[in-house]
Amino acid sequence: AFNLTWISTDFKTILEWQPKPTNYTYTVQISTKSGDWKSKCFYTTDTECDLTDEIVKDVKQTYLARVFSYPAGNVESTGSAGEPLYENSPEFTPYLETNLGQPTIQSFEQVGTKVNVTVEDERTLVRRNNTFLSLRDVFGKDLIYTLYYWKSSSSGKKTAKTNTNEFLIDVDKGENYCFSVQAVIPSRTVNRKSTDSPVECMGQEKGEFRE
């Protein structure tokens, strides 16, 4: 196997590799730097393996995976030292590297010349005490949101930032505005920003207006 790649968004984490097997199968193992190897996706002909269940146990750990190649019908060794051939993945630290999924604007509410915009706190697959944690639960203040907003009638964008999932912005009375948000982890060196959320505009379903 080669080109071992971690594909991870909001902690949903899949290891992918090449090539498509012809006359052999794969088994994947994963471990933390100091832990024991755990086997997953036994003798699969797929070229991917979902490792989410393992990495969500501790998203701040650094993980390493390896993919073993076995000739079809022979699960014994193929290497010169009596070991099956395997390839190591790059190291992967979910907390620092998982991609931030596209956020969603949950709602916006106008009261006079202020608009309260709320970002949906997406549920992750990280569990604590038998409950799934939200993105905010996991990242805490490491996660901020940036709001882009503009008058429907113009293209000039303004921005606001928040350490929570809410914004409260000033708007001109009688004007309609459009909004988009982006999740950001400023302390990261890679995968710092999500893609922008879908644009939501005043006058659509998600909004409320009160004098």
Epitope: R128, L133, S134, R136, D137, V138, F139, G140, K141, Y145, L147, A160, K161, T162, N163, T164, E166, F167, L168, I169, D170, S187
Partner: antibody
């Protein structure tokens, strides 16, 4: 009105673990705030130790990270500090504080707005 | 780590005078994360100013904050007897959160 109260031994022996608890009254520890520990060495300035969210998400001061554990017990409305392998340099007044969101510039940011009275911890044999 | 340097270390003034306290950061600090605290002997710090310039509820308007980037200022327009204390600036935008060394405002 939220109040915080630190508790724990005032004297700890060198190389042992310092353990303090902060009890939150007048509000829920699960209500969207963060909970911090700060210390102040005798006659000196303030040093941030770390913080925790009700979910267990933590941030620590890198200079203390290898020795610090902050945990939360939502059922008791408490959060705790453990500092291992203490030396005389860890002698200080230890404060717990609430980090609450305040509106600023279109968004919300966290500031330490409620503090406990502080508890003096001396490290000595 | 962002180092906050406060000056002067001690400010000796009389009641009714104006106090100007400086806080300089070793690198740029987002104003959203800059706060000022007051501490009196034997007491915990008290939040005065957040977002560099917004007064906390209940703080008299003689206290004002200003500045951006690396230079921030706390001004007490007319010192009252209860204002004599130590003042700390703090940044909470970058871990580790850091405090300045403090400025002691004492009675002249």
């Amino acid at each position: 009105q939220v109040q915080l109260q630190e508790s724990g031994p005032g004297l700890v022996k060198p190389s042992q673990t310092l353990s303090l608890t902060c009890t939150v009254s007048g509000g829920s520890i699960s209500s969207g705030q963060y909970w911090s520990w700060i210390r102040q060495h005798p006659g000196k300035g303030l040093e941030w130790i770390g913080e925790i969210y009700y979910s267990g998400s933590t941030r620590y001061n890198p200079s203390l990270k290898s020795r610090v554990t902050i945990s939360v017990d939502t059922s008791k409305n408490q959060f705790s500090l453990k500092l291992s392998s203490v030396t005389a340099a860890d002698t200080a007044v230890y404060y717990c504080a609430r980090d609450a969101p305040y509106y600023y510039g279109g968004g919300y940011y966290y500031y330490m707005d409620v503090w406990g009275k502080g508890t003096t911890v001396t490290v000595s044999s | 780590e962002i180092v906050l340097t406060q000056s002067p270390g001690t400010l000796s003034l009389s009641p009714g005078e104006r106090a100007t306290l400086s806080c300089r950061a070793s690198e740029s600090v987002d104003s959203s994360y800059l706060a000022w605290y007051q501490q009196k002997p034997g007491q915990a710090p008290r939040l005065l100013i957040y977002g560099a310039s917004t007064r906390q509820t209940g703080i008299p308007d003689r206290f004002s904050g200003s500045g951006s980037g690396t230079d921030f200022t706390l001004t007490i327009s007319r010192l009252e007897p209860e204002d004599f204390a130590v003042y700390y600036c703090q940044q909470a935008g970058v871990v580790p959160y850091t405090f300045g060394g403090g400025t002691k405002v004492e009675i002249k």
